[in-house]
């Protein structure tokens, strides 16, 4: 399992008028049931029941997101409508680039993301946990608009990816 | 069925205000991103604001602290609130669903028309 | 605020022939450039997304590349329900910005 290096772009609107870019550093965990490699796009918070929605099925989705779920504690969710790894192939069939789990609350859910599918995603999924996962979920819970570039190696500069 | 439309529009004076709103039906509103964008009759297209899932929302230079994006997720709509109107804000405004990008679900839009 | 300057303006060409529009982006925004086709009357349409990839539904002789700071969109073939207006779009830093379009006349 390789450590993901998650940075975290917020757009911020600044005094002068112009936008201003904050970039945050966390880690993560790659797991098995998607593919090692680097993504970036928005950030789009998901809730758990919200990938359980069948009705969306027939649209033409919005690709090149980022997908960030917390998962619930599993006694809230006793009969969950998707597994984890179900809800992560949705994430991506709906066009996300990448799908983050905040398992925090639900550390059982590594072991179903970890066990060996014969076929995983072609999409990064990632793990968080700890201070890493609080670091994210503060900057999702900003309600600002903020962009995830997930990499394999440590990024060398934060400014290096975001021409901002 | 995705679709999207967009009421309020009119003839208003400069320095007047006015509401539009975006029904969307057909999708999980609250899963997505919204976009307005609008258009000079016969001119280009121009990037209005966004707001994101959880309600975040950036603008273009030219509306920013004049316009407000925001949605009600319980009534399936987008809105934009046009403050302080121009003569230049005259357009048809467009609403379309989309992350960071507008995608492939756009509204037939609304005329909004400022004159004195 | 990125700059995004679309060539030509307009352009006239005949059915079968293979048409090039141009965006030049002011600043580096890696792939993040989409093009729309509108005909009058109607709403835009996507045709590519993030500079290379071709949306769902539209015909494979649109297509996309880009080089640098440079993006093209092509035609291989024109059909008569290709002309219409081309915009592009990028969607990299906010605000975000539409070029000026493209008018595609026949010839």
């Known amino acids: 399992k390789e450590t993901a290096f998650v940075e975290v772009v917020l757009f911020e609107s600044s005094p002068s008028g112009d936008y201003t870019t904050y970039t945050t550093g966390l880690t993560g965990r790659f797991s098995r049931a998607g593919a090692t490699l680097s993504a970036e796009g928005e950030i789009v918070q998901m809730h758990p029941l919200g990938l359980c929605n069948n009705n969306d099925e027939e649209d033409l989705y919005e690709y090149g997101w980022v997908g960030v779920v917390k998962l619930e504690q599993p006694e809230l969710d006793p009969k969950p409508c998707l597994t984890v790894l179900g809800k992560a192939k949705r994430a991506v069939q709906r066009g996300a680039t990448a799908v983050i789990f905040d398992v925090s609350e639900n550390p059982e859910a590594i072991d179903q993301l970890n066990q060996g599918s014969e076929d995983p995603l072609k999409r990064p999924v990632v793990y968080v946990k700890g201070a890493d996962a609080i670091k994210l979920m503060n900057i999702v819970n900003k309600q600002k608009v903020a962009r995830a570039r997930i990499q394999h190696r440590p990024p060398r500069q934060p400014t290096e990816y975001f021409d901002m | 069925e995705v679709q999207l439309v967009e009421s309020g529009g009119g003839l208003v004076q400069p320095g007047e205000s006015l509401k539009l709103s975006c029904s969307a039906s057909?999708?999980?509103?609250?899963?997505?991103?919204m976009h307005w964008i609008r258009q000079v009759p016969g001119k280009g297209l121009d990037w209005v604001a966004y707001?994101?899932?959880?309600?975040?929302?950036l603008y273009a230079d030219a509306v920013k602290g004049r316009f407000t994006i925001s949605r009600d997720n319980a009534k399936n709509t987008l809105y934009l609130e046009l403050n302080s109107l121009k003569s230049e804000d005259t357009a048809i405004y467009h609403c379309?669903?989309?992350?960071?990008?507008?995608?492939?679900?756009w509204g037939q839009g609304t005329l909004v028309t400022v004159s004195s | 605020d990125i700059q995004v300057t679309q060539s030509p303006s307009s352009l006239l060409a005949s059915l079968g022939e293979r048409v090039t529009i141009t965006c030049q982006t002011g600043?580096?925004?890696?792939?993040?450039l989409n093009w729309y086709q509108q005909r009058p009357g109607q709403a835009p349409l996507l045709l590519i997304y993030f500079a290379t990839s071709l949306q769902t539904g539209v015909p494979s002789r649109f297509s996309g590349q880009y080089s640098g700071r440079s993006f093209t969109l092509t035609i291989t073939s024109l059909e008569p329900e290709d002309i219409a207006n081309y915009f592009c779009?990028?969607?990299?830093?906010?605000?975000?910005?539409f070029g000026a379009g493209t008018k595609l006349e026949l010839r």
């Open positions: 057909g999708f999980t509103f609250s899963n997505y991103g």
């Open positions: 779009l990028q969607h990299y830093s906010p605000p975000y910005t």
């Open positions: 600043q580096s925004i890696n792939n993040y």
């Open positions: 707001i994101s899932n959880s309600g975040g929302s």
């Open positions: 379309a669903r989309g992350y960071s990008y507008p995608g492939p679900y």
